[in-house]
């Protein structure tokens, strides 16, 4: 059974991940972002189901494509370079999803824009955090 300290650590990591994802979303949604229209043409795979930490595997697989799209923006709205930002997210995701060995990501029927993709994972973080508090 998870201890209160491990639960607290998980909660903090999820909150960190949530803030990073929200920062990206805010950066690309900025009305001054001239590349947004082009960024919206890139599509991302969405998870068929995202209710447990192991489902973060589906986010992990799309982090490299996310970095590539963020490189397009060359936005001053991000405090970090996309490479560093995605690297930070990757570290958190790896810790959160744990050593589950048999999970193979299943994908939703439709691909999604970067905004839909980020919103889906923001909602995931918020949902898991709410179950921990």
């Amino acid at each position: 059974a998870p201890t209160s300290s491990s639960t607290k650590k998980t909660q903090l990591q999820l909150e960190h991940l949530l803030l990073d994802l929200q920062m990206i979303l805010n950066g690309i949604n900025n009305y001054k972002n001239p590349k947004l229209t082009r960024m919206l043409t890139f599509k991302f795979y969405m998870p068929k189901k995202a209710t447990e930490l192991k489902h973060l595997q589906c986010l992990e697989e799309e982090l490299k494509p996310l970095e590539e799209v963020l490189n397009l923006a060359q936005s001053k709205n991000f405090h970090l370079r996309p490479r560093d930002l995605i690297s930070n997210i990757n570290v958190i995701v790896l810790e959160l999803k744990g050593s589950e060995t048999t999970f193979m990501c299943e994908y939703a029927d439709e691909t999604a824009t970067i905004v839909e993709f980020l919103n889906r994972w923001i909602t995931f973080c918020q949902s898991i955090i709410s179950t921990l508090t």
């Epitope: 599509k43 795979y45 969405m46 595997q57 992990e60 697989e61 799309e62 982090l63 490299k64 494509p65 990757n90 050593s99 589950e100 060995t101 048999t102 999970f103 193979m104 990501c105 299943e106 994908y107 939703a108 029927d109 439709e110 691909t111």
Partner: antibody
Framework: EVQLLESGGGLVQPGGSLRLSCAAS????????MSWVRQAPGKGLEWVSA????????YYADSVKGRFTISRDNSKNTLYLQMNSLRAEDTAVYYC??????????WGQGTLVTVSS | EIVLTQSPGTLSLSPGERATLSCRAS???????LAWYQQKPGQAPRLLIY???SRATGIPDRFSGSGSGTDFTLTISRLEPEDFAVYYC?????????FGQGTKVEIK
């Protein structure tokens, strides 16, 4: 830059064995599912096997089930395909492919396996 | 198992012409799961389209994908000399995958 380099192909007699390797670089190998896809001479593409990022889940085409085993060593960034009880119809170029979602976004150049007496 | 049938088997066209390739599934396929590849002689396949309609990185915009359910299409708006090759459609939810038998686009 993503690179996949297959090796281990060659000529083998029916009933024999071979182990193919695929050395990966340019991406976080353990984050991605990988697959083997083959192509018989002059024919189309045939999916052979897949494995998830950690190596805990494997999948096989009916034509190779029970004879082929897919595995990976994430510490060496290498994918493997152990092929036993080889048949003439297994003759093909074998490609390893990185998965992005349900598609294959990067492919190696392939290694030729010839099963003949 | 879902079977993908591509048509025509061979398409003979001239550079500058429009190519329309069809991929029909034996049962409904989620658009997210449908991809198209190009293969030239002696080379590995290259991903062109994923999610039925999204171009992969570095793919020119003369390539486009469309369709849903059981009928999918790859269109090359104006054929360039380097586009003459074999094209495959593929579907799969993540583990197992199936490919169509391919359409060869040759110079007329």
């Amino acid at each position: 830059e993503v690179q996949l380099l297959e090796s281990g192909g060659g000529l083998v007699q029916p009933g024999g064995s071979l182990r193919l390797s695929c050395a990966a670089s340019g991406f976080t190998f353990s984050s991605y599912a990988m697959s083997w896809v083959r192509q018989a001479p002059g024919k189309g593409l045939e999916w052979v096997s897949a494995i998830n990022g950690s190596g805990g889940s494997t999948y096989y085409a009916d034509s190779v089930k029970g004879r082929f085993t897919i595995s990976r060593d994430n510490s060496k960034n290498t994918l493997y395909l152990q092929m036993n009880s080889l048949r003439a119809e297994d003759t093909a170029v074998y490609y390893c492919a990185k998965r992005r979602g349900p598609s294959f976004d990067y492919w190696g150049q392939g290694t030729l396996v010839t099963v003949s007496s | 198992e879902i079977v993908l049938t591509q048509s025509p088997g061979t398409l003979s066209l001239s550079p500058g012409e429009r190519a329309t390739l069809s991929c029909r599934a034996s049962q409904s396929v989620s658009s997210s799961y449908l991809a198209w590849y190009q293969q030239k002689p002696g080379q590995a396949p290259r991903l062109l389209i994923y999610g039925a309609s999204s171009r992969a990185t570095g793919i020119p915009d003369r390539f486009s994908g469309s369709g849903s359910g059981t009928d999918f299409t790859l269109t090359i708006s104006r054929l360039e000399p380097e586009d003459f090759a074999v094209y495959y459609c593929q579907q799969g939810p993540g583990g197992p995958a199936t490919f169509g038998q391919g359409t060869k686009v040759e110079i007329k």
